[in-house]
Structures are given as C-alpha cells and as structure tokens.
C-alpha cells in the first residue's frame, strides 16, 4: 500500500443535496429482466469518503456479527479484522459463530508499504442493505496487519470484488462475488455510485452522511443521468480496461496509446487517486500546469503532498482544466470518453488551515503499475461492473460534484482506429512477483 494512494485508502455533490436525484435521460440499452430498474433497498448503502474508502455493512457468522466492509474492486479477497487492533471498534469473533469452518490454511498479503496476514475459513455472509440472501463465503480472518487499517475510517474489513486470478494465496480461493452468484439467483453484475462530498467531512459527518450506493445484481436508473457507455473488460483479473486517448481541456496528450495502459489500466474503488504511468503523469501535469498558469502552485502540490488553500468558497475551479479519458468501445473502431472536473481531482482535506479556508490535495499521482482509475474518477460516474457480459459501463453520476459552468460527462461515439494496439501485453512472470507491489 502506498500511503495516500492504495488500499487501505489514505485519500464532488456540491450541485445537489444528498438524496436529490437528477432526472434520467433516455436509455438506449434494452431492458434485461432482473438486471435493471429500482433497487431501493440498496440505494445509499455506502458510507465513507474517497480518502479513506467507501464501506458497506455486512454480517458474518451465526448469530450475525455486523461489520463495516470496504468495497474494493482492485482485489479479490474478503478479509476482516479478527483480532483486537487499536484502530478497530469491533472485529470478527470466529469462536462466537456456530457456522464458522476453519480451512486450516494461512494467507499473507504484502503491499508496497504494509501488509495483512490471517487464517482462511468460511462462514455465512449477508449484506443487510443488499440482496435478501445469505451465502457461504471464504473469509480471511486478519490476525496481524501493518499500515492496513486506518484510524477513524470506520471499516473493519475489505470486500475484494475483482476476479479469482488475483485472489490470495492463489486463484483457487473463490472470491465473495463468485460465491454469491453461484449460490443464489443474483445476476453476475454489480454497480457502484461513489459520492464525493466536495468538501471535507469530519468523523461524525461521515457517519451521518451517505457515501453512495452498491447495487448488487443490477442497475438503478435513479443513480445516473444520460446513457451508459460500455468498455470491454480486457482480461478478468483486475477490472482491466483500455484507454485509447487522453485530453486535457480538449488538448490531446498525443502519446502512443500503449503508454496510457503500461502495464495495465484498471478500475479500482480501493484507490484514492487517478494514478498514471510515469510518462503519462509527467505529460498530464505539464499540461494541467499550463492550463492553470495564471496561478502557480508549489512543487509539492503536484506531488500530492502539499495542500493548497483558498478562502472558503473562492476555489478557482475555472482555472483548472477538465480531463478526458477515451475508452475502447464495444463496437469495432468506436470509443467514448469520460470527462472529470477539478472537483473530482482536487481532493478536499479536513482539519488543516482554518475554518475560513478550503484546502485540497492534488489527487492525480504517478504509478509504476499502470493506470488506476480510483475513487476520484469513480466519484464522477455511476460505474457498472457487468461481469456477465465482460464489460464496464460508465454514466454521469447523479451525485457528482460540479459547478454552474461545467459537469462531468460521458460522451460518444468517437471513431478510433487500431485500439487493440493500445493494450500492453505483460510478460508472463511468477505471480508472486507480479502481485507484491499492489500500489
């Protein structure tokens, strides 16, 4: 884990109050029974914020033990705190569960910084504000960790929603969502609406506020506006996609598109930032600096370290450019673009200067493991993880932060040739070396 970046996360609704849903435009996708419509019981079932993660309430064991679990599309283990820890208010007590089964196997997950380790078992799991089902799922009971749990984050475990290929200790450990789909009639699809506040929230405000929605088994019309546009899942490990073009305020970065996906591009709710490969990051920052050149900011700001503050309510959003990522479309030679605002990539930070200030960190950072479309991207959009059809959908989120002049957008189609060439083929290596630096 890189502090401030990757799980556990250490990192904009200004337009409408929570709960106010904007009217939907027409949806050209055909209705699919059981997949679309209203999922009232699941709407607003997430809490949290981009800097510390979004979590859902889950119950584990018999009788049920309630825990808050971080939703992470960038990993594939269901892992929960199972021993006392200074940052945990509660933890999974296996000895109190009559349905717990020990798998007599350990699991160790190191990150770039920090780690967790534990013991594998299975137990009955349900999601109170989710589908009305109970499944027997693999659980990693975390007995030791370092720089994993976050003080004040209010979550006690992690729900890895990616594919078995990246599960630990190996791909034979079935991920939770696979178990859910196998054991129930829940369609093989989930969707996420992460709602950034656009302003810093203190602990009590996070507990009281809505953080968004995880719709399990379907798509909720009320959570987005306009149309959903889909990009293929390139390979079922992470949720890997292909970026074919990048623009800053409409200006093409003009890089070989392979650079955008070197060595992969993934959609990851468990990462705070938009993370870009070194060359792409440098080009993007140069372009963002040029676009906002009427004001200069300290070098440390562009590194995501120093905070920049403005008097409350005077943040000059207009000087910062919009960023567009073009994604491979479902049709040959067709792409679409998703556009985020500075309200997404400048992350509000609490408890620093004075109450008369609004302070932000730059939430785009450098990566050595490819592009990571983290919470700052996802907070602009309703994102559909359509596993059944091996695709990811994007639509403008009904809760994204914007101003009166600009809004996040999902637009298409655009003609883009030779998009397959944009994908990078990772040389086959021992998976253990591939996985230890989950930046």
């Amino acid at each position: 884990t890189q502090h401030g970046i990757r799980l556990p996360l250490r990192s904009g609704l200004g337009g409408a109050p929570l709960g106010l849903r904007l009217p939907r435009e027409t949806d050209e996708e055909p209705e699919e029974p059981g997949r679309r419509g209203s999922f009232v019981e699941m709407v607003d079932n997430l809490r949290g914020k981009s800097g510390q993660g979004y979590y859902v309430e889950m119950t584990v064991g018999s009788p049920p033990q309630t825990l808050n679990i971080l939703v992470d599309t960038g990993s594939s283990n269901f892992a929960v705190g199972a021993a006392p820890h200074p940052f945990l208010h509660r933890y999974y007590q296996r000895q109190l569960s009559s349905t717990y089964r020990d798998l007599r196997k350990g699991v160790y997950v190191p990150y770039t910084q920090g780690k967790w380790e534990g013991e594998l078992g299975t137990d009955l799991v349900s999601i109170p504000h989710g589908p009305n089902v109970t499944v027997r799922a693999n659980i990693a009971a975390i007995t030791e960790s370092d720089k994993f749990f976050i003080n004040g984050s209010n979550w006690e475990g992690i729900l890895g929603l990616a594919y078995a290929e990246i599960a630990r200790p190996d791909d034979s450990l079935e991920p939770f969502f696979d178990s859910l789909v196998k054991q129930t009639h829940v369609p093989n699809l989930f969707s996420l609406q992460l709602c950034g506040a656009g302003f810093p929230l203190n602990q009590s405000e996070v507990l009281a506020s809505v953080g968004g929605s995880m719709i399990i088994g379907g798509i909720d019309h009320s959570l987005y506006t306009g149309s959903l546009w889909y990009t293929p899942i390139r390979r079922e490990w992470y949720y890997e996609v292909i970026i074919v073009r990048v623009e800053i305020n409409g200006q093409d970065l003009k890089m070989d598109c392979k650079e955008y996906n070197y060595d992969k591009s993934i959609v990851d709710s468990g990462t705070t930032n938009l993370r870009l490969p070194k060359k792409v990051f440098e080009a993007a920052v140069k372009s963002i600096k040029a676009a906002s050149s009427t004001e200069k900011f300290p070098d440390g700001f562009w590194l995501g370290e120093q905070l920049v503050c403005w008097q409350a309510g005077t943040t000059p959003w207009n000087i910062f450019p919009v960023i567009s990522l073009y994604l491979m479309g479902e049709v040959t030679n067709q792409s679409f673009r998703i556009t985020i605002l500075p309200q997404q990539y400048l992350r509000p930070v609490e408890d620093v200067a004075t109450s008369q200030d609004d302070c932000y960190k730059f939430a785009i950072s450098q990566s050595s493991t490819g592009t990571v479309m983290g919470a700052v991207i996802m907070e602009g959009f309703y994102v559909v993880f359509d596993r059944a059809r091996k695709r990811i959908g994007f639509a403008v989120s009904a809760c994204h932060v914007h101003d009166e002049f600009r809004t996040a957008a999902v637009e298409g189609p655009f003609v883009t040739l030779d998009m397959e060439d944009c994908g990078y083929n990772i040389p086959q290596t021992d998976e253990s070396t591939l996985m230890t630096g989950r930046a």
Epitope: E295, K296, P298, D299
Partner: antibody
C-alpha cells in the same frame, strides 16, 4: 544579486491606510519561479504572514487580514505593493517583503524591513 | 489550524556548545518545514528548508531533522554570531502562513 527594499511612510494615523512598496533589484519580478510576499513582526513578537502575489497578479492573503489587505504588482517598475486599510495600533510592526522560492514554498530572500508605527 | 510550538523559549549556552531546538506541529506537516535565524534589527534568514536541507551559504554546523510532527534544529558548535532568535515555519499548508513562536539562543 537580487535584493529587496521596502519603502513607505513610517507613521500612519489610526483608521487610515498603510501603503508600502517593495522594489526588486538585480532580477526580474516577472520570473516564473517566484511568488513575492509580505510578512510583519510587531515589536518584540513573532512573525505573521500577510500575503503573496505572483507577477500575473494572482494573490493569496492571510484570512485574518483579508478584508483589509490588498497586494498589487507593477512589473514595469519591478515593484509590488501592500495596502492595509483601517489600521489600528495593533498594526504597528516591522514590515518585510520577501521572495517565495524553492518551488514557491520558502521565503528564501528578505528585505531589511521597515518599521511602521500607527499613532495619532 | 496547524500550530507550531517551539521549545525551549530561551536556551542559554556558551560558545562551542551544542544547541538543540525543537519545533512541534499540532498535526503532520510531512517534511515541509523551514528554520529561520533572526538577529536583532535584521530580517530573518532562511537556514533550513524541507526539514533537513541547508539553504545556500549556510554553514555545515546547522542541521535539521525530523518529519511529521517533530522537528529539530541542531547547531553542532555555537559560534558567537549564532546567538539569535530561531523560528520554524510549516509550508505543508500553502500558501505558507504558520510560524512558530521562536526560540531565543542567548549567551550563558
């Protein structure tokens, strides 16, 4: 080498406006590498940041002084200025102009300072 | 608001002795901290930036250390010209606005 020199009246009456100018010599105020700032120090006390300006005219002010402060720049004269309105005795201080370098983060070069007394 | 607390308020030492000055931030400022020296009737002078980097022309007897919330300025062997007031300043929050209250190093 680059030098900064503050100038302006040493005595200002209460409720009036304090006006100071900082002249940059030995270098250009239009350098894209620096912000320029004002800091003050009441007699026998610590340092208080007032505000910064970039040659483009972009300004940042101390929230506690913002309603009374204006900082401006005149690139043709290689100068930047401070105006502090509605002064009281509490504004009596040595006023320093300084350059904000090292990635716009640190006050790495200071003027000698000028004492401004607010008194009737 | 980030508050910088310097200690001790006054340090009485003799030339040749080692001086250790402390600056504590009310919350983490990473390594974005500076140290200034101010002699009577003069403007402050930048000694250390980014917690541990000596500014141009600053003698090697001055060194800075620390990160997060606890920082130290060390003068390995006091010279007569080192007796002055020393201030720390955080620039983690930008624009840089917060100075510590100062430590006076006086001749014993």
């Amino acid at each position: 080498q680059l030098q900064l020199q503050e100038s302006g009246p040493g005595l200002v009456k209460p409720s009036e406006t304090l006006s100071l100018t900082c002249t940059v010599s030995g270098g250009s105020i239009s350098s894209s590498s620096y912000y320029w700032g004002w800091i003050r120090q009441p007699p026998g006390k610590g340092l208080e940041w007032i505000g910064n300006i970039y040659y483009s005219g972009s300004t940042y002010y101390n929230p506690s002084l913002k309603s009374r402060v204006t900082i401006s720049v005149d690139t043709s004269k290689n100068q930047f200025s401070l105006k502090l309105s509605s002064v009281t005795a509490a504004d009596t201080a040595v006023y320093y102009c300084a350059r904000l370098g090292h990635g716009y983060s640190y006050f790495d070069l200071w003027g000698r300072g000028t004492l401004v007394t607010v008194s009737s | 608001e980030i508050v910088l607390t310097q200690s001790p308020a006054t340090l009485s030492l003799s030339p040749g002795e080692r001086a250790t000055l402390s600056c504590r931030a009310s919350q983490s400022v990473s390594s974005y901290l500076a140290w200034f020296q101010q002699k009577p009737g003069q403007a402050p002078r930048l000694l250390i930036y980014d917690a541990s980097n000596r500014a141009t022309g600053i003698p090697a007897r001055f060194s800075g250390s620390g990160s997060g919330t606890d920082f130290t300025l060390t003068i390995s062997s006091l010279e007569p010209e080192d007796f002055a007031v020393y201030y720390c300043q955080q620039v983690y929050v930008w624009p840089p606005r917060t100075f510590g209250g100062g430590t006076k190093v006086e001749i014993k």
